[in-house]
Amino acid sequence: KSPIFGPEEVNSVEGNSVSITCYYPPTSVNRHTRKYWCRQGARGGCITLISSEGYVSSKYAGRANLTNFPENGTFVVNIAQLSQDDSGRYKCGLGINSRGLSFDVSLEVSQGPGLLNDTKVYTVDLGRTVTINCPFKTENAQKRKSLYKQIGLYPVLVIDSSGYVNPNYTGRIRLDIQGTGQLLFSVVINQLRLSDAGQYLCQAGDDSNSNKKNADLQVLKPEPELVYEDLRGSVTFHCALGPEVANVAKFLCRQSSGENCDVVVNTLGKRAPAFEGRILLNPQDKDGSFSVVITGLRKEDAGRYLCGAHSDGQLQEGSPIQAWQLFVNEESTIPRSPTVVKGVAGGSVAVLCPYNRKESKSIKYWCLWEGAQNGRCPLLVDSEGWVKAQYEGRLSLLEEPGNGTFTVILNQLTSRDAGFYWCLTNGDTLWRTTVEIKIIEGEPNLKVPGNVTAVLGETLKVPCHFPCKFSSYEKYWCKWNNTGCQALPSQDEGPSKAFVNCDENSRLVSLTLNLVTRADEGWYWCGVKQGHFYGETAAVYVAVEERKAAGSRDVSLAKADAAPDEKVLDSGFREIENKAIQDPRLFAEEKAVADTRDQADGSRASVDSGSSEEQGGSSR
């Protein structure tokens, strides 16, 4: 017996699509071997029509695809635009066509349902609107107009021109009689339900001279689009429901049991707690279309998602919907990286951000996820030399260590820095990750003076005290600018006396500025690193003033002032800064969502809160 399983008989009608799922044991070999769909010939051979290695027969060109889902042990063959010629015996299988790992499938494509003569077929999606047109003759112009639905053997009145409406259609049906010139009435049914499907009869007049017209209404439940994304990666659901629902509340929900569909996010401000920090609902276009980005994909995110429109912001009968089946591939190309980084007030964090190593030249970005309204992610820094004004001197994006990872350093932490941050690039949109910064109790490890004033033309020495835990780390000083932090020469002054219970391995490393000029004014960082991996940093602002008295300045911790006032973050520090987005590809596939740099709503951005790994703020 073959271990492959699938549908033995598939019956469809011309013009339709089929989606055939074949199940296989998900062993390592099976997951990666060739998958195929072939048609059995009269002499017993099986001619490949499509395979997972990219082959598509000319018979299937432009109308079929084969998708492998190794995690589930399934592959799916989609075939569209069916004709009766597609009827026949097929095999879905693994490996080579002639070997035994296959399953026989019979596909029968018929002309369609037997309909009464002169029956008009209306095929409409669930939740949409249908207009059934009913012609009549002049002698019935003044007579009663009605629409019946065939229920079993009996016609049941749905609506008529005297004002009757069947309770099942209340609030969503109307009968329109055209002007005197046109011998036509029409029945418009909104918010179509699956139960509305069936045979209808419209009638003008009630006697033997009445005009009758048959209609067959088919209400289609949307086929879910199969979406296959990597664990820790990102998915974007594009939802286009049409202009008729442009002003109706939109939602994305995930089907749980049965018809229950739990709201993931909606435009009324609801968001499921499991998606906190890793979801954005992009502002909708005038045509009512919108998109939802979910990042940091977890195994449990797999499932069926529906987007729709309803005033309640959740799925109701008659909501127009679109559907997706999301599969999350655990054999992910996206590396694990810490999803939580902890830092202390006044201290720093160094965040590692993965990106697709094939796109080393892409622009790197870091943004702060904000949950207000539908979520947004204003940019804070990029690799092109832009830093949001309120973050000057305390935020830097470094291309190191490179080869698929960049580093973001944020220091002078306050409790307001706690939150979710997204790493993204203008390249592969699936490589968007998130990290949550948590501010915990404790003291910064590195000790530096608060702010320092240097005198023009003199020498300035600024100390940085490193505790013994960093004895094996490289210690450095650098001058911050918006493209990074340029290394400066520094002197090891021996053990530090700034730490209690710390031995000879503590260090005092000083920065010396000789013959200070105006250009020396700015932010200086001292920090630790191991190779290209950065650890904790501390920042000092050096102001430069005219000479008052001769001599050099040697700053000690005791003389340290508070950090300069102009750098204190006020409550408005997340306000939008009017900086235009330079690269339209950053949010490719979406309309330019926002007109300011800050509003690059991460519409194609991503997060990784997919695991509980944590990283301390100071060292790797």
């Epitope: 399983f5 549908p7 469809s12 088919q218 289609l220 086929e223 049965g258």
Partner: nanobody, 127 residues
Framework: QVQLVESGGGLVQPGGSLRLSCVAS????????MAWFAQAPGKEREFVAA??????????YYADSVKGRFTVSGDNAKKTLDLQMKDLKPEDTALYFC??????????????????WGQGTQVTVSS
């Protein structure tokens, strides 16, 4: 209240035939997949056959043990499911359950992929 009611079970001789029927009422949807499972005394429920609907396409699935002997059919709109059983064998003796689910996805052979269940109808094949 959702109800799936099976009928058509009974005692039949080996080689004989039976037709099982299932009618669903109170379902909040036109079911997208319905199936038959069999449970022999002291054993787990086993998949027998299923039918799934997507739009105007139907998909029929069978267990290896019943291929060529059993035929599944149904009406999505009427929420009915039938199982025509021919050439019955003593090992087909079991309590036959009807199951339904709103979506035609997931492996149809796995009982956990169905939300609604009937009470069962007994089929006994014995001479």
């Amino acid at each position: 209240q959702v109800q799936l009611v099976e009928s058509g079970g009974g005692l039949v001789q080996p080689g004989g035939s039976l037709r099982l029927s299932c009618v669903a009422s109170g379902l909040p949807f036109s079911s997208s997949r319905m199936a038959w499972f069999a449970q022999a005394p002291g054993k787990e429920r086993e998949f027998v056959a299923a039918i799934g609907w997507r739009g105007r396409t139907s998909y029929k699935y069978y267990a290896d043990s019943v291929k060529g002997r059993f035929t599944v059919s149904g009406d999505n709109a009427k929420k009915t499911l039938d199982l025509q059983m021919k050439d019955l064998k003593p090992e087909d003796t079991a309590l036959y359950f009807c199951a339904a689910h709103p979506n035609d996805d997931g492996d149809p052979r796995i009982s956990g992929n169905y939300q609604y269940w009937g009470q069962g109808t007994q089929v006994t094949v014995s001479s």
